[in-house]
């Protein structure tokens, strides 16, 4: 078959046996179903460790696996066509066996998102680590092989087989061999516990063949739920050993005669079964039955028993243990909710705190409230949100967009704004004229002044400061202020030389401190607008309007 | 970014077969299947099939079935769809498409389009 | 194969208006699987809206999508001009991937 079994694990209704070999996931399915069982489910974390430990067992045994990431397939595929799908646990994957999906998965790493090819899961072993409990293969998933190209890593696989019951594992009395053989095909002298089917041969004595008793026994279902091997007292009793030989092969308490005969028996609570060797609690809750801290309440007259779990869980499908109930489901919150251990709580969104009427309320922030806005200058609160923006003359600027910064109109993305120098300040500019011109009445252009020599006119004192001036007329000349350590001008500006014929020097002198002469308060030409910024609002240029690269919508603060 | 560029316009006779190429860049190339889906103004947009790069396998329309073939190239991050027995009916823009990170076939990118012309 | 039926297949709207495209499929189809694409004339198409209601990256917000089972919809609450073009529906609920036969969205 090109796999061998090298390892069997028998626990609750199933057995787990774990396989070397490099066989496609379609081999190893089919040397699962030859023996009537499947790859391996992989359902619960208890699972998940039965799996384990029986991989555990076969590489104890196995002497050189070829890669140090091993692989061994189990049972979950997604066929062809059928897509991944990311809002399941199993991603759209589903086990060979059939069975419902169940919420527990163990992704080794984000799934290669496909639906044509057909998807097969392996075990993930990292055989430079020892195997802990705590650190349980990871699942991953890949092309599912082909015969004589298994995939990467393959290096053997994990079946399952399920079981009506199980039987006690027989007890020896005295010296001898004990070999099971499963209905699956393996043979083996330890099991925990035997499945329905099994045949038990004992060979009793110390290898003397003259002394050699056999014993033949069938693992049957003697009562519905209830399995056993139909002997009756412990096996290759011995006088010589009495009950110090393995107690005698008593589940409990062993009694000798004087003859070297023995007897088993029971502690108080406890009865003694049929096979004369096991024992069972006359109270059926006194073998912790219950787990997962359920708690095990009688039945009348205390034949039988329930499990009953505490606030916040429920009982399993085996109806033995407990597992949280997600309270989540009902959507209890009015934003998100975050299921815990047998109970919930309810969060909040970035943006939003709790409060409001009913549980679980949520309620915006006021991130604009006196004492606690982030913005520089304007704050607007959004719900869930909130944006910043800047007074006239500003920008928004910073990375999280919560501060201003002054527009220098001078070097605006349509040019610059004046007719021959412009002077930025703080929130505005203003214009000026180099010698021999005079600012016009608009406050943008320069008119031919009565022929002088002296320094340009420059920006205007600090009480003329005010509103933006200017208006887009024809440019003659440009100049831009060379900026102050702060943002503020320096007295000297930068200057180009006027397109309109003049004899006038560019002048590099200091700046008097002179008001434009005549200027008015605002002028607005509706007819004629300026380039903004891309996407800006376009409005007209001078003014209070804003001129160079402002949008006043602002941006959404990052909270 | 993701860019999916496809080969040239072809103009064939009647019972020939295309090859119609589809080169990848922008991602890792067996990361996504590719698909094809050919349109003309009769028939609209129809799905011809799709490759897993990653494992060569295929899936075609039943209405395709013998006729195409999809094969790719890793080498060079590059997938083709071959169409024989070609009829005036196969006139239609080919494009090539995938889903990206996207689930659940939400085609996300497209290549640009082959105009496949057949006339004799 | 599942047909996928696109109603009506030419639809004239003002800008400003709203228009309300329709997909019918011939058997149900799952939400996740039901996809819109745009395509203007000599472009290819472009993912608009996927599983049902989620618009592809960079679509504005005056798009919308519903619907499960076999009748789902487009709805463009105000049309604006670059949105006249063809839409077409497309599913997945196995082999073959289907499209609708498209509706037109012009100008009245």
């Known amino acids: 078959t090109g796999a061998d079994t090298e390892a069997v694990v028998c626990v609750g209704t199933a057995c787990y046996t774990a396989h070397s070999g490099k066989l496609s996931a379609a081999e190893a399915q089919n040397h699962c179903n030859q023996n009537g069982g499947n790859l391996a489910t992989v359902k619960s974390k208890e699972e998940a460790q039965h799996v384990q430990r029986v991989l555990a067992q076969l590489l104890r045994r196995e002497a050189a696996l070829t890669a140090r990431m091993s692989k061994f397939w189990i049972g979950l595929q997604r066929e062809k066509g059928k897509c991944l799908d990311p809002s399941l646990p199993l991603k759209g994957f589903s086990w060979v066996g059939g069975g419902e999906d169940t919420p527990y998965s163990n992704w080794h790493k984000e799934l290669r998102n496909s639906c044509i090819s057909k998807r097969c899961v392996s075990l993930l072993l990292d055989l430079s680590q020892p195997l802990l409990p705590s650190r349980l293969p990871k699942w991953s998933e890949g092309p599912c092989g082909s015969p004589g190209s298994p995939g990467s890593n393959i290096e053997g696989f994990v079946c399952k087989f399920s079981f009506k019951g199980m039987c006690r594992p027989l007890a020896l009395g005295g010296p001898g061999q004990v070999t099971y053989t499963t209905p699956f095909q393996t043979t083996s002298s330890s099991l925990e516990a035997v499945p329905f089917a099994s045949a038990a041969n004992v060979a009793c004595g110390e290898g003397d063949k003259d002394e050699t008793q056999s014993h033949y026994f069938l693992c049957k279902e003697k009562a519905p739920d209830v399995f056993d091997w139909g002997s009756s007292g412990p096996l290759c009793v011995s006088p010589k050993y009495g009950c110090n030989f393995n107690n005698g092969g008593c589940h409990q308490d062993c009694f000798e005669g004087g003859d070297g005969s023995f007897l088993c028996g029971c502690r108080p609570g406890f009865r003694l079964l049929d096979d004369l060797v096991t024992c069972a609690s006359r109270n059926p809750c006194s073998s912790s039955p219950c787990r997962g801290g359920a708690t095990c309440v009688l039945g009348p007259h205390g034949k039988n028993y329930t499990c009953r779990c505490p606030q916040g869980y429920q009982l399993d499908s085996s109806q033995l243990d407990c597992v949280d109930v997600d309270e989540c489901q009902d959507s209890p919150c009015a934003q998100e909710c975050v299921n815990t251990p047998g109970g919930f709580r309810c969060e909040c969104w970035v943006g939003y705190e709790p409060g409001g009427p009913g549980e679980g309320a949520c309620q915006d922030v006021d991130e604009c409230a006196l004492g606690r806005s982030p913005c520089a200058q304007g704050c607007t609160n959004t719900d869930g949100s909130f944006h910043c923006s800047c007074e006239e003359g500003y920008v928004l600027a910073g990375e999280d967009g919560t501060q201003c910064q002054d527009v220098d109109e001078c070097v605006g993305p349509g040019g610059p704004l004046c007719d021959s120098l412009c002077f930025n300040t703080q929130g505005s500019f203003h214009c000026g004229c180099l010698p021999g011109w005079v600012l016009a009445p608009n406050g943008v252009s320069c008119t031919m002044g009565p022929v002088s020599l002296g320094p340009p006119s420059g920006p205007p004192d600090e009480e003329d400061k005010g509103e933006k001036e200017g208006s887009t007329v024809p440019r003659a000349a440009t100049a831009s202020p060379t900026r102050g350590p702060e943002g503020t001008p320096k007295a000297t500006p930068t200057t180009s030389r006027p397109s309109l014929s003049s004899d006038a020097p560019i002048t590099s002198a200091p700046l008097k401190m002179l008001a434009p002469s005549g200027s008015p308060g605002v002028w607005r030409e509706p007819s004629i607008h300026h380039a903004t910024a891309a996407s800006g609002p376009q409005e007209p240029a001078g003014g209070d309007s804003s001129v160079a690269t402002q949008n006043n919508d602002g941006t959404d603060g990052q909270k | 970014q993701v860019q999916l560029v496809q080969s040239g316009a072809e103009m064939v006779k009647p019972g020939a077969s295309v090859k119609i190429s589809c080169k990848a860049s922008g991602y890792t190339f067996t990361d996504y299947e590719m698909h094809w889906v050919r349109q003309t103004p009769v028939y609209g947009l129809e799905w011809i099939g799709g490759?897993?790069?990653?494992?060569?396998?295929?899936a075609y329309n039943q209405n395709f079935k013998g006729r195409v073939t999809m094969t790719r190239d890793t080498s060079i991050s590059t997938a083709y769809m071959e169409l024989s027995r070609l009829t005036s009916d196969d006139t239609a823009v080919y494009y090539c498409?995938?889903?990206?990170?996207?689930?659940?076939?939400?085609?996300?990118?497209w290549g640009q389009g082959t105009l496949v012309t057949v006339s004799s | 194969e599942i047909v996928m039926t696109q109603s009506p297949a030419t639809l004239s709207v003002s800008p400003g208006e709203r228009a309300t495209l329709s997909c019918r499929a011939s058997?149900?189809?799952?939400?996740?699987?039901l996809h819109w694409y745009q395509q203007k004339s000599g472009a290819s198409p472009r993912l608009w809206i996927y599983?049902?209601?989620n618009l592809a990256f960079g679509i504005p917000a005056r798009f919308s999508g519903s619907g499960s089972g076999t009748e789902y919809t487009l709805t463009i609450s105000s049309l604006q001009s670059e949105d006249f073009a063809a839409y077409y529906c497309?599913?997945?609920?196995?082999?073959?991937?289907?499209f609708g036969g498209g509706t037109k969205v012009e100008i009245k």
């Open positions: 058997s149900s189809v799952s939400s996740s699987y």
């Open positions: 599983s049902t209601s």
């Open positions: 498409t995938n889903y990206g990170n996207l689930y659940y076939y939400a085609m996300d990118y």
């Open positions: 490759i897993d790069p990653e494992t060569g396998d295929t």
């Open positions: 497309q599913q997945y609920s196995g082999y073959p991937l289907t």
